[in-house]
């Protein structure tokens, strides 16, 4: 029972985590304009992995995709790659874990096979979570470096040479979503690995005796049901988990509601 709960919970936690990783990857707010100690502007800039956006105080929002591939910083490409690898591994892990769930019966799948699948999906979730955490952390490090560089530029005597106002960027909401989602996926993966240990059939010192009936064959094991992991009456009330996670991609059009003036 505890094994089933651990496996089921691991699956749900990972599902939420992967949904979060997908959401973070799609979000535009990876970096947002730093408003602290800056002149108050009527324009707010924010950037994602795929496009940069400008929201005017009028409510008008304009987003431009990064249509170049070669012109983008290597770090940004690396973050994109890490997030996509995390999503792909997580998606495969989810697919594998659905078949591995103890509360779902597929044909005459052996317990050992379910245990192996649970372990595989657990490892995939762990790697997926680590990829997301790494991706978000690399981006955050990039922001911190650029922040202090632009701060230094603001206070060095550039005079009238600079034609644009130095826009500093700080952590956006997507970073926190990514960190939490990566952590959840990692925790879910660990839970799946723990559940795998309980799923693996126990080795016994005695040989099973088979009694063959004429119509169909049933294998009986002496010593009660300690080693049993079959779908008997005790599985009637097991919850079958279905992933209802949705990601919302912000679609802003003009005119829109404005959240600041």
């Amino acid at each position: 029972m505890a094994v089933t709960a651990c496996q089921g919970l691991g699956f749900v936690v990972s599902l939420i985590g992967i949904a979060g990783i997908i959401a973070a990857t799609c979000m535009d707010q990876w970096s947002t304009q730093d408003l602290y100690n800056n002149p108050v502007t009527a324009v707010f800039n924010y950037q994602g992995l795929w496009r940069s956006c400008v929201r005017e105080s009028s409510g008008f929002t304009e987003c431009r995709g990064y249509f170049t591939l070669l012109g983008l910083p290597a770090m940004l490409q690396a973050v994109r790659a890490l997030m996509i690898v995390g999503i792909v591994l997580g998606a495969i892990g989810l697919l594998v874990s659905i078949f591995a769930l103890k509360c779902i019966r597929i044909g005459s799948m052996e317990d050992s096979a379910k245990a192996n699948m649970t372990l595989t999906s657990g490892i995939m979730f762990i790697v997926s979570g680590l990829c997301a955490i790494a991706g978000v952390s690399v981006f955050a490090n990039m922001l911190v470096t650029n922040f202090w560089m632009s701060t230094a530029n603001m206070y060095t005597g550039m005079g009238g040479m600079v034609q644009t106002v130095q826009t500093r960027y700080t952590f956006g909401a997507a970073l926190f979503v990514g960190w939490v989602a990566g952590g959840l996926t990692l925790i879910g993966g660990v839970m799946m690995c723990i559940a795998c240990r309980g799923l693996a059939p126990e080795e016994t010192n005695y040989k099973a005796v088979s009694y063959h009936a004429s119509g169909h064959s049933v294998a009986y094991k002496p010593g009660g049901f300690k080693a049993s992991t079959g779908f008997g009456s005790n599985t009637k009330n097991k919850k079958i988990y279905d992933g209802g996670a949705r990601t919302e991609d912000e679609v802003q059009s003009y005119p829109s509601k404005h959240d600041y003036v």
Epitope: A42, F60, V165
Partner: antibody
Framework: QVQLVQSGAEVKKPGSSVKVSCKPS????????IDWVRQAPGQGLEWMGG????????VYNEKFQGRVTLTADKSSMTAYMELSSLRSEDTAVYFC???????????WGQGTLVTVSS | DIVMTQSPDSLAVSLGERATINCKSS????????????LTWYQQKPGQPPKLLIY???TRESGVPDRFSGSGSGKDFTLTISSLQAEDVAVYYC?????????FGGGTKVEIK
């Protein structure tokens, strides 16, 4: 078409307050900011502040901070500008305007002349 | 506050001739996020509210004749009336739409010579 209709001219005594209304029509009231701009006789334009009628958020020109209050009533779809502690130099035409893309003002009210005189 | 300086204060141009108004900002109005300059031009005729002509420094508002054009970037901007018409006699204002408080230039009065 978009229209912003303002209240009539006012004559006020120094130290008193004035409340000017602005009723837009022809668009969704809560979707655009309403800004207030004043123009003293024979002078240039001076931005006073803006309000988001949807959320009630306001931004003011520090020059008027504490003296000007911008409000919006969603039920009557009307924006208001109240200026207190009036002085003779507050004699001006007060305009309301709709803020659009580029943070520019595309539609303006006809203006309300406020005269401060003892 | 951002100071918007317009020049000249007044301008007399013959009908059909080119009129050029300059506007200088004390700080750059170019937003790095979208590479747009947050500067607007208005036309105001006596007894009327201002009328929007150009936003984002060079984007003409719908319904504005194409003889009006805006140019410039960063701190220096220009409004050009390619062929002055009688109905263009007015005061022209530039506005900073990037920094709060949103500030206007002192205005340039355009007259017919």
């Amino acid at each position: 078409q978009v229209q912003l209709v303002q209240s009539g001219a006012e004559v006020k005594k120094p130290g008193s307050s004035v409340k000017v209304s602005c009723k837009p029509s022809g668009y969704a009231f809560t979707n655009y900011l309403i800004d207030w701009v004043r123009q003293a006789p024979g002078q240039g334009l001076e931005w006073m502040g803006g309000i988001n009628p949807g959320s009630g958020d306001t931004v003011y020109n520090e020059k008027f901070q504490g003296r000007v209050t911008l409000t919006a009533d969603k039920s009557s779809m009307t924006a208001y500008m109240e200026l207190s502690s009036l002085r003779s130099e507050d004699t001006a035409v007060y305009f309301c305007a709709r803020r659009v893309r580029g943070n520019s003002f595309d539609s303006w009210g006809q203006g309300t002349l406020v005269t401060v005189s003892s | 506050d951002i100071v918007m300086t317009q020049s000249p204060d007044s301008l007399a141009v013959s009908l059909g001739e080119r009129a050029t108004i300059n506007c200088k900002s004390s700080q750059s109005l170019l937003n790095s996020g979208n590479q747009k300059n947050y500067l607007t031009w208005y036309q105001q005729k006596p007894g009327q509210p201002p009328k929007l002509l150009i936003y984002w420094a060079s984007t003409r508002e719908s319904g504005v004749p194409d003889r009006f054009s805006g140019s410039g970037s960063g701190k220096d901007f220009t409004l050009t009336i390619s062929s002055l018409q009688a109905e263009d006699v007015a005061v022209y204002y530039c506005q900073n739409n990037y920094f709060y408080p949103l500030t206007f230039g002192g205005g340039t009065k355009v007259e017919i010579k």
